[in-house]
Amino acid sequence: EEELQVIQPDKSVSVAAGESAILHCTVTSLIPVGPIQWFRGAGPARELIYNQKEGHFPRVTTVSESTKRENMDFSISISNITPADAGTYYCVKFRKGSPDTEFKSGAGTELSVRAKPSAPVVSGPAARATPQHTVSFTCESHGFSPRDITLKWFKNGNELSDFQTNVDPVGESVSYSIHSTAKVVLTREDVHSQVICEVAHVTLQGDPLRGTANLSETIRVPPTLEVTQQPVRAENQVNVTCQVRKFYPQRLQLTWLENGNVSRTETASTVTENKDGTYNWMSWLLVNVSAHRDDVKLTCQVEHDGQPAVSKSHDLKVSAHPKEQGSNTAAENTGSNERNIY
């Protein structure tokens, strides 16, 4: 009689994570008598997956009734597959004895596990940066298998080219991670911009995963200042305004100085928003010129988002205005939050 052969018809099987894997194995003879065992891997480090004779293997079930005497089908099903189950599985016939001894092995079936990448997480720089600066964004996704994966970067729908991507580990692994760093040059119009990291993988059926970062969390647009003198509202009173334009984020503090001395400090509250997402704000100061003998230097000083203050000055000519006798203090009315339409 021809010697028993162990036949594993499938060289490879690919299964999605969470599904069951069926590993086929048949023998060509009932002799010699003895059990079948399934192993993952070969050599001393091989793992026992199923022993027909004894043991508890909760995730493994036999496809046919392997306990029947005439049974020659020893295929198994492994439930709830994870990337850690990947490897080559061997169906091995043992000869009955004390103890049972290994008789013949099948050629092996390689099980590969398809696992979806996690949702890409995009993170930007820790500190805000100003327009014309280059900032880095990172994108990470984990737990996918097989290793082949495609990652693209976009800014407002336009594909970026300045990025570097690594897939780890380099060698064989049950699952993989991808890490990419993209460089983005900021512009003044980027408050509403988005950076998108797009990951495509065989498990996603052509529907890539996306991670986004809003540049509003990264950009700082410094304000431009303009100090102007408005027409005289009343006798001896001059209205000076400080226009603070095109700034982002909103966090801003304004200080008026008269000849270098602090006159008033206020925080931007009712701002107007421009189409590009930046803000405008206006503060005004009513100066009683009759209280001044000499010309007055008025300074609008702005501290934006914790940055060093910027300022703009305006010289108010006192000589051009008649002095009010007996008055030596400047009675000021101040106002702010005037709406300014552009």
Partner: antibody, heavy 122, light 107 residues
Framework: EVQFQQSGTVLARPGTSVKMSCKAS????????MHWVKQGPGQGLQWIGA????????TYNQKFKGKAELTVVTSTSTAYMEVSSLTNEDSAVYYC???????????????WGQGTLVTVSA | DIQMTQSPSSLSASLGERVSLTCRAS??????LNWLQQEPDGTIKRLIY???SLDSGVPKRFSGSRSGSDYSLTISGLESEDFVDYYC?????????FGGGTKLEIN
């Protein structure tokens, strides 16, 4: 009680070969992989390779392929290792140990032979 | 190959002291790690298998643990016979690799 009895000290000339033995007793020889480990003078341990007595399946550390050859005689429950083309680098103590026929945690390298000292000298 | 980086390579300690030896695995080995003890005469004995399981006959002052890729052998209350060499071994994948060893010396 499981025991491994290794052959005695060997003094050998460079370029020659030595064959050492490890006789197992106290359990079923065919249910285990027999492993060999090298320890150079004042050095650490290095795994050389292993043999499975049932079918003479062998697995080697790449560093020792062509240098060491593992064999078994199941009828006497004895494992052998031949080290060829000897140089001073091969002067070491060689140990035998075992693991179960599959990766069973409790059975990895529990029992060790006493070691065979090989000295290579002209 | 999986590298096992063992530290320290030597350690001086006093009787009764508590010491810890560490092995770091360069790749994932799960819990497949042994700790071995080698006497000056060359005799090798396994103390711990599967990271933290104590072999029978090994005193309870020996214990094994894991934190990520770092595996530790702790001896609490050193006794005179403990001042020998110790090795870790990974048996997750071939080639099976040992740490460089730690020589435990009496202070």
């Amino acid at each position: 009680e499981v025991q491994f009895q290794q052959s005695g000290t060997v003094l050998a000339r460079p370029g020659t070969s030595v064959k050492m033995s490890c006789k197992a007793s106290g359990s079923t020889f065919t249910s285990y992989w027999m492993h060999w480990v090298k320890q150079g003078p004042g050095q650490g341990l290095q795994w050389i390779g292993a043999i499975y007595p049932v079918n003479n399946d062998t697995t080697y550390n790449q560093k020792f392929k062509g240098k060491a050859e593992l064999t078994v005689v199941t009828s006497t429950s004895t494992a052998y290792m031949e080290v060829s083309s000897l140089t001073n680098e091969d002067s070491a103590v060689y140990y035998c140990t075992r693991s179960f026929y599959y990766s069973l945690d409790a059975a990895w390298f529990v029992y060790w032979g006493q070691g065979t000292l090989v000295t290579v000298s002209a | 190959d999986i590298q096992m980086t063992q530290s320290p390579s030597s350690l001086s300690a006093s009787l009764g002291e508590r010491v810890s030896l560490t092995c770091r695995a360069s790749q994932d080995i799960g819990s497949r790690l042994n700790w071995l003890q080698q006497e000056p005469d060359g005799t090798i004995k396994r103390l711990i298998y599967a990271t933290s399981s104590l072999d029978s006959g090994v005193p309870k002052r020996f214990s094994g643990s894991r934190s990520g890729s770092d595996y530790s052998l702790t001896i609490s209350g050193l006794e005179s016979e403990d001042f020998v060499d110790y090795y870790c071994l990974q048996y997750a994948s071939s080639p099976f690799t040992f740490g460089g060893g730690t020589k435990l010396e009496i202070n």
